[in-house]
Interface confidence: medium
Amino acid sequence: SKSSWGLENEALIVRCPQRGRSTYPVEWYYSDTNESIPTQKRNRIFVSRDRLKFLPARVEDSGIYACVIRSPNLNKTGYLNVTIHKKPPSCNIPDYLMYSTVRGSDKNFKITCPTIDLYNWTAPVQWFKNCKALQEPRFRAHRSYLFIDNVTHDDEGDYTCQFTHAENGTNYIVTATRSFTVEEKGFSMFPVITNPPYNHTMEVEIGKPASIACSACFGKGSHFLADVLWQINKTVVGNFGEARIQEEEGRNESSSNDMDCLTSVLRITGVTEKDLSLEYDCLALNLHGMIRHTIRLRRKQPIDHR
């Protein structure tokens, strides 16, 4: 059987789960007693077309309700487990009162008020986040939706819509809550080396240590085959066979400008004359391609103290 829930002293309207697109009449029963539920509106619980209305709902209304669709050649029976809960005393809304989570992104920033289509409601719908009324202009209530401009992770949380159902000249409150989570929309791009500059020459001192950092960015999110590495004379450092020159493992991952970047550091423990004649390539690669920045070393000119 399908489940529906509501809050005490609020309106609750439910549909027959067997209904489909049927236009045949629907009868409702208390399933434990088989007692028929009337269609007269003067009753607090009554049937209207395929809908069962609790105006308002009480905790003792909880139970299993049966609906029967009578068609000329077949009777279809559906069962609905209705639970009416007391209003939570605090702002923490329990899971059993939550409707499905909405996953938003910078492109999808719309929250729909759950079940509202079942009710005879009039705008505006009031919206609350974690029980606080939303008053910032970024939040726009339109019809049964809440639109959020410039969505960020700070907008995640529980959103409650509150509206009024009108029946027989009486207004009833309805509230419904659902979670909103923000999914980062990742993107992958051709790598960009941010440092060192293209065809850069770096000054070093013979006999002294030197280190060159290479950083590249790849987009945002998960990156396939993304790496930053060094080559010396077109040979990867590990195969170059010079113990003085090492590539720093455990590449530093950072995020700049909301982009995912990797850094690899080439360390020379003591620079020799021979190192000045070598070509050092910083390579950044991923699924989309590879980019190379070549760096050369030159001897630092001694400062003239004359």
Partner: antibody, heavy 123, light 108 residues
């Protein structure tokens, strides 16, 4: 004529590991990327991961992350795929497949396949 | 991940007839990133088409590929006995690279 020659069939116990090899003969191994794709009996193809031997960089499909290791030995033109914590649902034919490099970068379709290695996981 | 859906699951065709196989992606992919493979029982797959419409080396002209966005088609203009096999589409637009579940082309 370039060929990808794979190691022979294996029978493994649940919880153990298997290491399958794929040797490239004829051609420049370092200019390929090698991927591993598996096919369970009567099922479709499932990509597991890829290595670029020239750079020694490998990456994996999320489903296999932490359980699969792909390596390559440029000196012998051989790629390896090791799958650990084997379970019965890992019973499949494991294929190595080549992506060739064009002037710009690798073409990530598979233009050459090994004949496959049947790995049977059974207690 | 991008889900590739092939239809029909099985296609019964007489030799000499035309066969049209369909492949649908769950989201739009650039046509440059779709490949088709042929697989015969007990054999490895063989690349037929890449870039949605370019025939791989040695593939006969009766095989042609077309489509863009989410809808792609492999056409075999006149089926030969050696063409009866399972055909897979694959997207390599974004990882994980994914294959369709295959279409079996059988003799009618």
């Amino acid at each position: 004529q370039v060929q990808l020659v794979q190691s022979g069939a294996e029978v493994k116990k649940p919880g153990s590991s298997v290491k399958v090899s794929c040797k490239a003969s004829g051609g420049t191994f370092s200019s390929y990327a090698i991927s591993w794709v598996r096919q369970a009996p009567g099922q479709g193809l499932e990509w597991m991961g890829t290595i670029i031997p020239m750079f020694g960089i490998a990456d994996y499909a999320q489903k296999f992350q932490g359980r699969v290791t792909i390596t390559a030995d440029e000196s012998t033109s051989t790629a390896y795929m090791e799958l650990s914590s084997l379970r019965s649902e890992d019973t499949a034919v494991y294929y190595c497949a080549r992506s060739s490099r064009s002037s710009s970068w690798y073409n990530w379709y598979f233009d050459l396949w090994g004949r496959g290695t049947l790995v049977t996981v059974s207690s | 991940e991008i889900v590739m859906t092939q239809s029909p699951a099985t296609l019964s065709v007489s030799p000499g007839e035309r066969a049209t196989l369909s492949c649908r992606a769950s989201q739009s992919i650039s046509s440059s990133y779709l490949a088709w493979y042929q697989q015969k029982p007990g054999q490895a797959p063989r690349l037929l088409i890449y870039g949605a419409s370019t025939r791989a080396t040695g593939i006969p002209a009766r095989f042609s590929g077309s489509g863009s966005g989410t809808e792609f088609t492999l056409t075999i203009s006149s089926l030969q006995s050696e063409d009866f096999a399972v055909y897979y589409c694959q997207q390599y637009y974004t990882t994980p690279w994914t294959f369709g579940q295959g279409t079996k082309v059988e003799i009618k």
